[in-house]
C-alpha cells in the first residue's frame, strides 16, 4: 500500500509565548500530509490543521479555553492524495507530543515600558499590560488578568553615568523608585513568575532612558 512511504512525525515541540501556542514538528512532508489532534487529559480529541503540508499548527484557540489544563497533541501522517489510507495496523501513523500546561509553561513575552514620570526625587515607571489571546466573557485578558499576583516585574535601573544596576520589584505594573536629583537614569524591565521552575523569566524590555520622549519630568 501507499502507506509504506509515510513516516511518523517526530520532534514534536510546543512553542508558546503569552499563550500564543504553536505545535511544531518534523519532517518536511514528502508525499504526505498531516492532521493534528489535541485534547486535555480527560477530554475528547479535537482535530485541527487538516491534511496540511505545514509542519506547524496553531493550537492557541484550543489551549486558551483553559490555560491551567494539561494538553496532549498528536500528529497523524497520511499519504498525499490518499488520506483514507491507513497503516499496517489499520490506523494512520501518529506521534504524541509532550504534555503541555500553558499556565506553567508558556514563555513570558518581552515586556515594554509604557511610560515613566519623574516627580522630584521619585520616578514612577509603568509597564504595558500586554493583551493575551485568553478570553473571558468575550474580552481578551491581559497578562496581569491571567497570572494575577503570580506575575511580578523586576525593574533594573541605573544612572546613565554608571554601570551598576539597582533592582526594584512589583506585583502590579507600576514601580515607584527613589532617584538622585539631577541624574538621568535608564530603565529595563523583566517579567518573572517566581513560582515556576522553568521559563521563569522573560527577555528584558528595550532600555528606556530619561531625556527621551517616553518620559516626563516635573520639578516639584
Amino acid at each position: 500500500s501507499g502507506t509504506t512511504n509515510t513516516v511518523a512525525a517526530y520532534n514534536l515541540t510546543w512553542k508558546s509565548t503569552n499563550f500564543k501556542t504553536i505545535l511544531e514538528w518534523e519532517p518536511k512532508p514528502v508525499n504526505q500530509v498531516y492532521t493534528v489532534q489535541i485534547s486535555t487529559k480527560s477530554g475528547d480529541w479535537k482535530s485541527k490543521c487538516f491534511y496540511t503540508t505545514d509542519t506547524e499548527c496553531d493550537l492557541t484557540d484550543e489551549i486558551v479555553k483553559d490555560v491551567k489544563q494539561t494538553y496532549l497533541a498528536r500528529v497523524f501522517s497520511y499519504p498525499a492524495g490518499n488520506v483514507e489510507s491507513t497503516g499496517s495496523a489499520g490506523e494512520p501513523l501518529y506521534e504524541n507530543s509532550p504534555e503541555f500546561t500553558p499556565y506553567l509553561e508558556t514563555n513570558l513575552g518581552q515586556p515594554t515600558i509604557q511610560s515613566f514620570e519623574q516627580v522630584g526625587t521619585k520616578v514612577n515607571v509603568t509597564v504595558e499590560d500586554e493583551r493575551t489571546l485568553v478570553r473571558r466573557n468575550n474580552t481578551f485578558l491581559s497578562l496581569r488578568d491571567v497570572f494575577g499576583k503570580d506575575l511580578i516585574y523586576t525593574l533594573y535601573y541605573w544612572k546613565s553615568s554608571s554601570s551598576g544596576k539597582k533592582t526594584a520589584k512589583t506585583n502590579t505594573n507600576e514601580f515607584l523608585i527613589d532617584v538622585d536629583k539631577g541624574e538621568n537614569y535608564c530603565f529595563s524591565v523583566q517579567a518573572v513568575i517566581p513560582s515556576r521552575t522553568v521559563n521563569r523569566k522573560s527577555t528584558d524590555s528595550p532600555v528606556e532612558c530619561m531625556g527621551q520622549e517616553k518620559g516626563e519630568f516635573r520639578e516639584i
Epitope: I152, K166, A168, P194
Partner: antibody, heavy 120, light 107 residues
Framework: EVQLVESGGGLVQPGGSLRLSCAAS????????IHWVRQAPGKGLEWVGY????????YYADSVKGRFTISADTSKNTAYLQMNSLRAEDTAVYYC?????????????WGQGTLVTVSS | DIQMTQSPSSLSASVGDRVTITCRAS??????VAWYQQKPGKAPKLLIY???FLYSGVPSRFSGSRSGTDFTLTISSLQPEDFATYYC?????????FGQGTKVEIK
C-alpha cells in the same frame, strides 16, 4: 536537588587576585539571580554583589566596587567572583546564594562557602 | 542604603523558652524581609521570607511578623537545635542589607 558549590578560595597576598566559582546544579542559573555574600571571621554577613545571568546585569557593594567583578557562564551553569587588589579586610568566607526573584527575594539556597585569606 | 538594626546582639535562653528577636529598618521596606539561621561553620539557612511566611521545611515554632518598619522573629519554644545566630535581611532595594546578627546561647 538544588545545590551551589563554591571553590577557588585560598591564601593570597595583599594586592593579589583570586577567582571564586559557584557551580549550580538542580536549576538553571539564567532563571534566577546569583548573589555573593561574605563573612569575616567572627563577624556578620556582608552582601558583596549580584549578577542576573540572563542579561549580565550586576551591582556591587561600595566596599568592593572597582576591585571585584561578578560574571556567569550559563553554558557551565556557573557564576564567578573575580577579586583583584585584595586587602586584609577581604579575608572572609565567601558564599554564593540563589535569589528566587520573588517580591521579597529571599536567598533560598546557599553554597557551603569557601575561605579566602589575604595575608602576607 | 537601608540599615537593618537588629537587637539584641546576643541572648541566653533555656530549652522551652519563648525567644523574640527584632529588626528595625531605617526606612520603609514593605514586607521584603527575610530571616536566616546560621550555625558555626555552616551556611545560613532561610527561615522566614516576606516578613511572615515560613519557608518550606522550617518548623512551625518559628514565626515572623511586621509592624511598620519593625520586624520580629519569634521562636515559640526553643529547642536544642535552635541555638545559633539569626540574621534579618531586607531586599526591598539594592543593595540588600543584613542585620548585625543575634546569637542565641544556652543559659
Amino acid at each position: 536537588e538544588v545545590q551551589l558549590v563554591e571553590s577557588g578560595g585560598g591564601l593570597v597576598q595583599p594586592g593579589g587576585s583570586l577567582r571564586l566559582s559557584c557551580a549550580a546544579s538542580g536549576f538553571t542559573i539564567s532563571g534566577y539571580i546569583i548573589h555573593w555574600v561574605r563573612q569575616a571571621p567572627g563577624k556578620g554577613l556582608e552582601w558583596v554583589g549580584y549578577i542576573d545571568p540572563s542579561n549580565g546585569y550586576t551591582y556591587y557593594a561600595d566596599s568592593v566596587k572597582g576591585r571585584f567583578t561578578i560574571s556567569a557562564d550559563t553554558s557551565k551553569n556557573t557564576a564567578y567572583l573575580q577579586m583583584n587588589s585584595l586587602r586584609a579586610e577581604d579575608t572572609a568566607v565567601y558564599y554564593c546564594a540563589r535569589d528566587d526573584q520573588s517580591l521579597s527575594s529571599p536567598f533560598d539556597y546557599w553554597g557551603q562557602g569557601t575561605l579566602v585569606t589575604v595575608s602576607s | 542604603d537601608i540599615q537593618m538594626t537588629q537587637s539584641p546582639s546576643s541572648l541566653s535562653a533555656s530549652v522551652g523558652d519563648r525567644v523574640t528577636i527584632t529588626c528595625r529598618a531605617s526606612q520603609d521596606v514593605n514586607t521584603a524581609v527575610a530571616w536566616y539561621q546560621q550555625k558555626p561553620g555552616k551556611a545560613p539557612k532561610l527561615l522566614i521570607y516576606s516578613a511572615s511566611f515560613l519557608y518550606s521545611g522550617v518548623p512551625s515554632r518559628f514565626s515572623g511578623s511586621r509592624s511598620g518598619t519593625d520586624f520580629t522573629l519569634t521562636i515559640s519554644s526553643l529547642q536544642p537545635e535552635d541555638f545559633a545566630t539569626y540574621y534579618c535581611q531586607q531586599h526591598y532595594t539594592t543593595p540588600p542589607t543584613f542585620g548585625q546578627g543575634t546569637k542565641v546561647e544556652i543559659k
